[in-house]
């Protein structure tokens, strides 16, 4: 067990310009408050996922009010440390969030009104017992400097805070096979505190509070032997002795999840939900009040002034759940044009572009006609994210610059032979045949299968196709 | 700032019609996509149906063939005709549109407008 603090330093402009305007004014006075989200691991999680380790609410800072004219200077900021009480180990690494929050003290209908400011993310490696770790981060033009510290509450020592220390017996050493406590010299490392009633023969752990069983035995307390008859759901080690699977402790095996929580297994652990009123890895914090800000994204939290009575959030369009942690997706409703993929980041939707458009919704296309010639006359026509030409006659290619070989296809039927032409193609015709591309045969007769040939023009002359 | 105002809602029987609007108000604005969610009581809040970016109309399994999403690009309205209505069609239904301001893409959604089908 142990406590996250959190310190505040500074709020205010970035450098650099488009210096922010002051959130408050003369007309509008307002404070700041902030509120951080822990939660455990380095993975990249969405902003309203819960917070596993804990979430904490600073105090409300003095009330500010803009000097007209004057640039937006660091904000009058609350008194105090935002701490986070962890009932676990400490994990070592850990991802958070921490909001600015503004609240606004005009004369607002139905109380003061609370707006978002500014929200920041990170991940972090953080030992606990050590140092303060400096940190700056930026949300726009805004600028944010804080410090943390993870520290274990007596008697839990270590950098996961998982060691117990106890006062020494005996003034000169500690017991058997039991360590001084560093840095508490005067004090002795004490054996992990299992899981009460968790069996000493049969169980283990290597935590406080868990209960782990040894090859051949189950159960919440490990009291339980593992039936070796029927060998069915295998999913523990070999046992030596009966040759097959015996099933191992399910990582919900006894339900780890304390205050009615249901747990469902994940790929590598478990996860627990939790009834309102309840949070944690385990469901294990208990008598959350309005107080301790459990209402996330803005939600409003009614009702929860003692921890004997539930609070309730009234969540801001567009987030849901008991603590208005679960954001609706926007994304079913396909802003993206163009097929493009749409991408709820939470304070932003962005669309990623298909090959050819751009935008922050797709809509330009980028190989549109615009400012694209087709060359010889050709005329620009525009389709599925690209342009092509359709050209005049006697020219090809992409923007119609190649001259075509109007032979190339071999247009002149029977054996006569073709000539490229200015305009077009010539065909002269083998003995027998007429007609522009020698389609006609010319009849014994003298007479053609087709009206007169034009005056001057005899059958077996080169026809010109235009 | 756009204002979206939803209304029609209101009591009906299983079987019945409603017709629902969403008026779009503001200065200078553009729709990029605009359709309706809905959140029963103790549920998350699901879209329903609408006019995707590319203005093609889209619709979840659980409303094909029963509602119907419309526009009236002169009022800036969009409709949401709702026909043999079921009991677990009960809900608040909100309009949300993606709407274009200036240069930036911002998301609104309306105050929402209660639907409740009991016999």
């Known amino acids: 067990a142990g406590v996250f603090e959190l310190q505040i330093h500074s709020f205010g402009p970035g450098p650099g310009p488009g210096a922010p305007r002051s959130p408050c004014s003369a007309r509008l006075p307002c404070r700041l408050f902030f509120r951080v989200c822990l939660k455990p691991g380095l993975s990249e999680e969405a902003a309203e996922s819960p917070c596993a380790l804990g979430a904490a609410l600073s105090a409300r800072g003095p009330v500010y009010t803009e000097q007209p004219g004057a640039p937006a200077p660091d904000l009058p900021l609350p008194d105090g440390l935002l701490q986070v009480p962890f009932r676990d180990a400490w994990p070592g690494t850990f991802s958070f969030i921490i909001e600015t929050w503004r609240e606004e003290l005009g004369d607002q209908i139905g109380g003061p009104a609370w707006s978002l400011l500014a929200r920041v993310a990170g991940r972090r490696r953080l030992a606990a017992g050590g140092p303060w770790a400096r940190d700056i981060q930026r949300a726009g033009a805004w600028e944010l400097r804080f410090s943390y510290r993870a520290r274990c509450e007596p008697p839990a020592v270590g950098t996961a805070c998982t060691r117990l220390c106890r006062p020494r017996s005996a003034p000169s050493r500690c017991g058997p096979g039991l360590r001084p406590c560093a840095p508490l010299e005067d004090e002795c490392e004490a054996p992990l505190v299992c899981r009460a009633g968790c069996s000493p023969e049969h169980g283990f752990c290597e935590q406080p509070g868990e209960c782990r069983c040894l090859e051949g035995w189950t159960g919440p307390l490990c009291t339980v032997p593992v039936s070796t008859s029927s060998c069915l759901s295998p999913r523990g080690p070999s046992s030596a002795t009966t040759g097959c699977l015996v099933p191992g402790p399910g990582p919900c095996d006894g339900n780890p999840c304390a205050n009615g929580g249901s747990c469902s297994e994940t790929p590598r652990s478990f996860e627990c939900t939790c009834p309102r009123g309840f949070y944690g890895l385990r469901c294990e914090v208990s008598g959350v009040t309005c107080a301790d800000g459990p209402c996330f994204n803005g939600g409003l939290c009614v009702g929860g002034a003692d921890p004997d009575s539930a609070y309730i959030c009234h969540c801001p369009p567009g987030f849901q759940g008991s603590n208005c942690e679960k954001r609706v997706d926007r994304c079913s409703l396909q802003p993206c044009r163009n097929g493009g993929l749409c991408l709820d980041l939470g304070h932003a939707l962005r669309c990623r572009c298909r090959a050819g458009f751009a935008g922050p919704r797709c809509e330009h296309d980028l190989d549109d006609c615009a400012g694209r010639a087709c060359a010889n006359g050709g005329t620009c026509v525009e389709g599925g994210g690209a342009h092509r030409c359709s050209c005049a006659l006697g020219f090809g290619g992409r923007d119609c610059r190649e001259r075509a070989d109007p032979c190339a296809a071999r247009p002149c039927a029977h054996g006569g032979r073709c000539y490229a032409h200015f305009s077009g193609l010539v065909c002269a015709c083998a003995p027998g045949y007429m007609g522009a591309r020698c389609e006609f045969p010319v009849h014994p007769d003298g007479a053609s299968a087709l009206p007169a040939a034009p005056p001057g023009l005899r059958p077996g002359d080169p026809q010109r196709y235009l | 700032e756009v204002q979206l105002v939803e209304s029609g809602g209101g009591e009906v029987q299983p079987g019945g019609s409603l017709r629902l609007s969403c008026a779009a108000s503001g200065s200078d604005f553009s729709i990029n996509a605009i359709g309706w969610y809905r959140q029963a009581p103790g549920k998350q809040r699901d879209w329903v149906a609408g006019?995707?970016?590319?203005?093609?109309?889209t619709y979840a399994e659980s409303v094909k063939g029963r509602f119907t999403i419309s526009r009236d690009n002169a009022k800036n309205t969009v409709y949401l005709q709702m026909s043999s209505l079921r009991a677990e069609d009960t809900a608040v239904y909100y309009c949300?549109?993606?709407?274009?301001?200036?240069?930036?893409?911002?998301?609104?959604w309306g105050q929402g407008t209660l639907v409740t089908v009991k016999p």
């Open positions: 006019f995707t970016g590319d203005g093609v109309t």
């Open positions: 949300a549109a993606d709407v274009k301001i200036g240069g930036d893409y911002e998301w609104f």
